[in-house]
């Protein structure tokens, strides 16, 4: 071409009719005028759809690629059963990396870039309707949903997208039910859906499958009052519309079938992108035909990237932008409501938000009030945890029933069967078996069930934990364990246990008003002041006792020898008198011990002068020893008191941890969280972390066994334990005051009534009665003012 001639850029198109081909040519002319560039001249080259894939691929090669087209526009074929006619266009052009712009093709398979690597489109795939459903769920506060999807690419794509959106909101479908495409029997599946709590059914299916679902749903009375059916465009089209229930809410992509509008917008996008592309360097021309040509168009991937990043603001169909899969973003939908077999627009989705027109909506069953989206399931799954006196767990009798027992008031203990692990000790095999649960919380549950008219099945938490957030496999993702985890995952509908209300938990679950107000306290072993039988030895060290013992015998021997051999030992005043005998060894021993032990000795004293001198010295020494011993013994008996008890959370032994004084709490409990979260308690937490126990029962036993010096736990539990186990005592002021509440999911229909029932129970004295029955009765004498006594221990 001459230097001043514009560069001819061919744009190809595969369109539905000759009329649309004419529109395409007009759109290209308009684009040329709009850009008014003397450098580039766009040229339209088009064909209409061919009856089969081979002919279509050949036509793309012979009529379009042979013209060195930079891009190919392709509309969705007019025949509804011939779904994949854009496929040969996509495959053929894609092989050479020539971008293909779909105009009205909605199937999600075209988003798969490993198959359709050069495919973009000015419409969104059907799976993007999930964004509208999700937004409608938000607008109408529907949290319980059932997702009913065909088990094909379309259904799975819609499911995946909706689940991703729900995950961001930390929510999930109550159930995802899949059916085989083309199935004629979905009754069993819908029966399963009917049993669930959710009443919002989101359906993603082909026209024919949707019709099958609607027919079965009508037979099962699942299309009347209380139900909500949210569907897409296919599900309110053609055959599906004949069977769709009144009140259904469906979607229609605005301008979705307006091929001429999409031709205009696609040409506008391509024209804009071509001008951008040709400003770049090293641009190669597209291939000329397919015969003998296996090389890709080198600039093709670059041109596709330019197209994908295009922003065409003033499109006939609104603003045209593409996501990373080449799918249209910010598409607008009409929200349609089937009323008396007519589709009525009752809202709009403007690309980001749903704007409903509630006045116009007629809900299933002819209702004008928005359905709440769930049915109150009257059989609740209750999770609890072994924590006396709130929940006692005992094995069942051989016949599977619970042993009859009586409370301190003489009333029979109300027991319920609760399934759970039969052994919580680590390392032992755990089997889920029926057991008997009773206690404060069980009485409360029975009362709630009676006043609120629900039935229940109780199970013990599988991992034996109350619930904390833990990292999953060292990732940043955190998941709740314990009762919290079971509640949030739907394994339980309600936590009825001494679950501490705290902020971290309250962000994820709904707590009732507290049924028990309490705090944290410290459990220690009670030190009974007593002195052992060997305490009389304490005033002297063993070496001194040894020396005293040795001295007694050495003195005795010395006395004996002096008395026996001293020349001055004997003299006669007169010879007739009988001579006094010298000290025998035994009388010397008697004298020596007698002087020491201060017994008056009337006989057997030394006779010789030297022995008497030694005796006097020994007597003086004995006097000092005895006086010292007596004074020391008195002092020791006075001071022989047990070590001072812990004064509370600020006790130096807790604040300045050492291995001499071990204290702990229960792993992954609210107390654990409390110490972990409080910066000023971090030193304590580091000490506790190493020593924490799996359960409160284990920790209490460890205190009794002197393996643990102090156990920090809920005051209600510890005060009860101290009142039952007389060797234990709680100490210090309560700290971190809190309460126990019943846990429910945020969307629980029961939350209001549970709180009201608990408040009533406080008012009418029922909680006070439970407290007296289970928590406050005393087994041990609380007085501790006995004197120190000697014992054999």
């Amino acid at each position: 071409r001459a230097a001043c001639d514009p560069k001819i850029v061919n744009i190809g198109a595969v369109l539905s009719t000759r009329k649309h081909e004419q529109m395409f040519r007009e759109a290209v002319n308009q684009a040329n005028k709009r850009h008014g560039s003397w450098k580039i001249q766009l040229n339209a080259t088009s064909v209409t759809h061919k009856p089969n894939a081979i002919q279509m691929a050949l036509s793309v090669c012979e009529d379009l690629i042979s013209s060195q087209v930079y891009a190919i526009l392709v509309s969705h074929p007019p025949t509804p059963n011939d779904h994949f006619t854009p496929t040969p266009v996509s495959y053929t052009a894609g092989f050479y990396r020539i971008p293909v712009l779909g105009l009205t093709t909605r199937m999600s398979i075209y988003s798969d870039k490993s198959i359709h690597l050069s495919f973009l489109r000015t419409v969104p795939p059907y799976s993007h309707q999930s964004s509208v459903w999700f937004e409608m769920m938000r607008v109408y506060s529907w949290n319980h949903i059932i997702l009913l999807v065909s088990d094909d690419h379309e259904g799975r794509a819609a499911q995946k997208r909706l689940e991703t959106l729900l995950e961001e909101r930390e929510s999930k479908a109550e159930k995802v039910l899949q059916f085989d495409p083309g199935t004629k029997n979905v009754t069993a599946l819908l029966m399963e859906a009917k049993e669930l709590e959710a009443r919002v059914i989101i359906l993603s299916a082909s026209e024919d499958d949707a019709a099958t679902v609607y027919r079965a749903a009508a037979m099962l009375n699942m299309t009347g009052s209380g139900y909500v059916w949210l569907v897409g465009e296919r599900e309110i089209s053609g055959n599906a519309l004949r069977y769709a229930p009144d009140g259904i809410l469906g979607l229609q992509l605005i301008n979705g079938k307006n091929e001429s509008a999409h031709i205009s917008d696609a040409v506008g996008v391509v024209a804009q992108a071509v001008h951008e592309l040709l400003e770049k360097e090293n641009i190669t021309d597209p291939p000329r035909g397919c015969v003998g040509n296996t090389n890709i168009w080198k600039t093709g991937p670059l041109f596709k990237r330019v197209l994908m990043s295009s922003k065409y603001a003033d499109g006939v169909t609104g603003r045209v932008e593409f996501n990373e899969d080449g799918d249209r973003k910010f598409a607008n939908y009409s929200i349609m409501n089937l009323q008396n077999r007519k589709l009525v627009q009752v809202g709009i989705y403007n690309g980001t938000h749903v704007i409903p027109n509630d006045r116009k909506i007629i809900w299933p069953g002819g209702e004008t009030e928005k359905p709440r989206g769930y049915q109150m399931s009257t059989r609740l799954k209750i999770v609890t945890i072994h924590q006396e006196p709130f929940v006692y767990v005992k094995p069942t009798l051989s016949d599977g029933t619970c042993k009859e027992e009586f409370t301190v008031n003489g009333d029979p203990v109300k027991k319920v069967i609760c399934t759970g692990p039969n052994d919580t000790s680590p390392g032992s095999p755990r089997h889920t078996v029926p057991q008997c649960c009773y206690g404060f919380c069980i009485d409360l549950l029975i009362k709630l069930a009676r006043t609120m008219n629900f039935t229940y099945e109780v199970h013990l938490v599988a991992d034996g934990k109350f619930g904390t957030q833990e990292r999953v496999n060292n990732s940043n993702k955190k998941e709740w364990n314990g009762m919290m985890g079971e509640l949030l995952s739907g394994q339980a509908d309600m936590i009825v246990a001494p679950l501490t209300i705290n902020n971290e938990r309250a962000q994820y679950i709904e707590f009732s008003k507290p049924f028990k107000y309490q705090g944290l306290t410290i459990l220690v072993k009670k030190e009974i002041p007593r002195s052992t039988l060997d305490s009389f030895m304490q005033p002297f060290q063993s070496t001194l006792w040894l020396l005293v013992g040795l001295s007694v015998h050495v003195v005795a021997v010395m006395l004996y020898l002096l008395d026996r051999f001293s020349p001055f030992g004997r003299f006669k005043v007169n010879s007739e008198e009988e001579e006094e005998d010298a000290l025998t060894l035994s009388s010397a021993m008697w004298f020596s011990w007698g002087v020491l032990l201060n017994s008056g000795i009337g006989e057997g004293a030394p006779r010789s002068f030297s022995a008497r001198i030694l005796g006097m010295v020994w007597a003086g020494f004995a006097m000092i020893i005895v006086a010292s011993y007596t004074a020391n013994l008195a002092a020791f008996l006075v001071l022989d008191r047990p070590e001072e008890r812990i004064t509370g959370i600020n006790d130096p032994r807790l604040r300045n941890p050492s291995d001499k004084f071990i204290y702990a709490t229960v792993k992954q409990s609210s107390v654990d969280i409390y110490f972990r979260r409080q910066v000023e308690l971090s030193t304590m937490y580091r000490h506790m972390e190493k020593h924490n126990y799996e359960s409160a029962a284990e920790a209490i036993q460890a205190v009794r066994d002197n393996k643990l010096h102090a156990f920090i736990w809920d005051s209600a539990v510890l005060e009860f334990e101290a009142s039952q186990k007389c060797d234990l005592v709680t100490t210090g002021e309560l700290f971190f005051r809190s309460g126990f509440g019943i846990g429910m999911r945020k969307d629980s229909p029961w939350k209001q009534n549970v709180s009201l029932s608990i408040l009533k129970s406080h008012e009418n004295g029922f909680m006070e009665d439970l407290d007296k029955t289970w928590v406050r009765y005393q087994e041990c004498d609380s007085r501790s003012n006995a004197p120190a006594t000697l014992t054999f221990e």
Epitope: Q339, K342, L343, V344, Q345, I355, N357, R359
Partner: antibody, heavy 119, light 107 residues
Framework: QVQLQESGPGLVKPSETLSLTCSVT?????????WHWIRQPPGKGLEWIAY???????DYNPSLKNRVTISRDTSKNQFSLKLSSVTAADTAVYYC????????????WGQGTLVTVSS | DIQMTQSPSSLSASVGDRVTITCRAS??????LAWYQQKPGKAPKLLVY???NLADGVPSRFSGSGSGTDYTLTISSLQPEDFATYYC?????????FGQGTKVEIK
């Protein structure tokens, strides 16, 4: 062919109740559609008053709500309007119309009846 | 209530002229708009529904366009029978309200 015909007194005294009836031929008012009353004061624009649906539910213009009652007589295939405590400002041509709620439009109208409020 | 403002309130035109009447809503009505023609002493007659769709039996010289808050009724070639008052009306919210009307007169 659907036809709507308004009927009622042409003159009403102030503070009295205005009563109008719309007779529908060629279509059952219980089968489908919304059935409306609209008025037009002389030389002025159109003002919507109320509707009754095929299933008997209704809706009123908030500015007239406490004075308006709409009802139907299915045996006669008629629907009626009652407007209480009328004043001279209620003088208007009163039309009944059918709304095709699928296309959101009044596709059939009666020819209108002039009601004058005067003592 | 959503207010509908028509302009102009009246216009003079000759047979064969292209006439454009606009209607602005006080908020987005999402194409829930109808146009009516009313001749003196007669009931209004539906011309266009859903902003762009021509009602049955309405000549093709009438067309509707617009979206959001701004809508237009166009008569491509004015005919003698087209001299009348034209009203727009929204159906988005309750109550449905009408524009004040545009009177098309012979020049």
């Amino acid at each position: 062919q659907v036809q709507l015909q308004e009927s009622g007194p042409g003159l009403v005294k102030p503070s009295e109740t205005l009563s109008l009836t719309c007779s529908v031929t060629g279509y059952s008012i219980t089968s489908d559609y919304y059935w409306h009353w609209i008025r037009q004061p002389p030389g002025k624009g159109l003002e919507w008053i109320a509707y009754i649906r095929y299933d008997g539910r209704n809706d009123y213009n908030p500015s007239l709500k406490n004075r308006v009652t709409i009802s139907r007589d299915t045996s006669k295939n008629q629907f009626s309007l009652k407007l209480s405590s009328v004043t001279a400002a209620d003088t208007a041509v009163y039309y009944c119309a059918r709304e095709d709620y699928g296309s959101s439009s009044f596709d059939y109208w009666g020819q209108g009846t002039l009601v004058t409020v005067s003592s | 209530d959503i207010q509908m403002t028509q302009s102009p309130s009246s216009l003079s035109a000759s047979v064969g002229d292209r006439v454009t009447i606009t209607c602005r809503a006080s908020e987005n009505i999402y194409s829930n708009l109808a146009w009516y023609q009313q001749k003196p002493g007669k009931a209004p007659k539906l011309l266009v529904y859903a902003a762009t769709n021509l009602a049955d039996g309405v000549p093709s010289r009438f067309s509707g366009s617009g979206s959001g808050t701004d809508y237009t009724l166009t008569i491509s070639s004015l005919q003698p029978e087209d001299f009348a008052t034209y009203y727009c009306q929204h159906f988005w919210d309750s109550p449905p309200t009408f524009g004040q009307g545009t009177k098309v007169e012979i020049k």
